[in-house]
């Protein structure tokens, strides 16, 4: 349940819409019910109720990151910020948007070929895979020094969705984030009650597969606000 | 390369503590979770603690709860485990790791609990 | 929590043979979220398999993983002489994290 690994997992850290009073967390326990996934493991999430507050960049929309909005500003409230396009300045990956990558402090491309003579490490944690580069999913060509990755399986660490192989997406996994399957036809989702606020999900799901909408299940329309099921449905 | 190098294990008596530090190089510490896992005497390996990229989330084993606490400072590279009110049963050598599953390992550290 | 149960607990066999370990969870993974490491004495463990069935960074080609719900598999289609080692599975799939027990693959 929600409560069970909410108070046996310290979540420190986090905005008071998420977190509670500071210095109290996981106070925000009753907000949202836990709820099974279709396949059977446990999920859970707490909904934001205020504009962005977050605490890990996951937590915000694929165009941004989580960061103080001040430079230098208080670490404990942080905020959706937007992504930093290509030649803008960084500190990690998730600062850049989509496509590119965080190297040397500058978002970069990370469609341009890259070389051999590059350090592999900051090549292929670009992906989110770096663990798999050799017998894995990474394959050279001796005639060139362009390096060529296949990306993420299901289970695979990644960085975002843009890591995973298709039909799969990037999403929270305990301390980490790994490639889980994108959503089914009558699949549980999440629906999110702001757009870009994610919310705290330890298990957290995919969005819902081309031409599907995470919508109320028809069902449980009586239901009370916070015990509705959602489900991925044709638009 | 990937490197994980702990240290701060050695001998505490029952009830005593210690502070565990695991020095990372070699990749973007902060983009990845981290765990330590340790391993008694000729016995197989536990999970004892997680914690994620930016260090706002962490998890912790049902054995270890309430005794351990996991903190990584980004900008040092460093990953820490703080384990207080120390058993004997905690005998064993830790280990830090990259990730959920283990990718890259330190060499461990081993951390006797006697009196 | 989910055990994890691997059988046999120990494997008598000679370089050059398939080695084929099992690996039983209490319950079904609904997800491949399942590793498998090498340890050898004295040594941290190695990242073999990720995923159920991807291979991780070095690990050469005789080594595959295979399953899903409750049985899983790893395979070393031709055993070399530093593949005897002890060899864990582990679930990444709920919580808590846990470990099989191992298998140590010894020389006959």
């Known amino acids: 349940t929600l409560n069970s690994v909410l108070n046996s997992n310290a979540i420190k850290n986090l905005p008071p819409p998420l977190g509670g009073a500071a210095g109290h967390p996981g106070s925000a326990v009753s907000a949202a019910p836990g709820i099974l996934y279709p396949g059977g493991n446990k999920y859970q999430t707490i909904d934001n109720y205020q504009p962005y507050p977050c605490a890990e960049d996951e937590e915000c929309g694929t165009d941004e990151y989580c960061a103080s909005p001040t430079r230098g500003g208080d670490a404990g409230v942080q905020i959706c910020l937007a992504c930093r396009k290509r030649r803008k300045r960084c500190m990690r990956h998730a600062m850049c948007c989509p496509g590119n990558y965080c190297k040397n402090g500058i978002c970069v491309s990370s469609d341009q070929n890259h070389f051999r003579g590059e350090i592999e490490e900051t090549i292929t944690e670009s992906f989110g895979n770096d663990h798999s580069t050799l017998d894995g999913y990474s394959r050279r060509t001796t005639l060139s020094s362009k390096m060529y990755h296949t990306k993420g399986q299901e289970g695979s660490v990644c960085l975002r969705s843009s890591d995973c192989a298709s039909g799969l997406c990037c999403a929270r996994h305990f301390w980490s984030k790994i490639c889980k399957p994108v959503l089914k036809e009558g699949q549980v989702c999440t629906k999110h009650r702001r757009k870009g606020s994610h919310g705290l999900e330890i298990f957290q799901r995919c969005y819902c597969g081309e031409g599907l909408s995470c919508r109320i299940q028809k069902d449980h329309h009586q239901a009370s606000n916070s015990s509705r099921l959602h489900t991925c449905q044709r638009h | 390369q990937v490197q994980l190098v702990e240290s701060g294990g050695g001998l505490v008596q029952p009830g005593g503590s210690l502070r565990l530090s695991c020095a990372a190089s070699?990749?973007?510490?902060?983009?990845?979770?981290m765990t330590w896992v340790r391993q008694a005497p000729g016995k197989g390996l536990e999970w004892v603690s997680g914690?994620?990229?930016?260090?706002?989330?962490?998890y912790y084993a049902d054995s270890v709860k309430g005794r351990f606490t996991i903190s990584r400072d980004n900008s040092k590279n460093t990953l820490y485990l703080q384990m207080n009110s120390l058993r004997a049963e905690d005998t064993a050598v830790y280990y830090c790791?990259?990730?959920?599953?283990?990718?890259?390992w330190g060499q461990g550290t081993l951390v006797t609990v006697s009196s | 929590d989910i055990v994890l149960t691997q059988s046999p607990a120990t494997l008598s066999l000679s370089p050059g043979e398939r080695a084929t370990l099992s690996c039983r969870a209490s319950?079904?993974?609904?997800?491949?979220?399942l590793a498998w490491y090498q340890q050898k004495p004295g040594q941290a463990p190695r990242l073999l398999i990720y995923?159920?069935?991807n291979r991780a960074t070095g690990v050469p080609a005789r080594f595959s993983g295979s399953g899903s719900g409750t049985d899983f598999t790893l395979t070393i289609s031709s055993l070399e002489p530093e593949d005897f080692a002890t060899y864990y599975c582990q679930q990444y799939g709920d919580e808590p994290i846990t470990f099989g027990q191992g298998t140590k693959v010894e020389i006959k």
């Open positions: 995923g159920a069935s």
């Open positions: 914690i994620s990229g930016s260090g706002s989330y962490t």
């Open positions: 319950q079904n993974l609904f997800s491949p979220y």
């Open positions: 790791a990259r990730t959920i599953y283990m990718d890259y």
């Open positions: 070699g990749f973007t510490f902060n983009n990845y979770g």
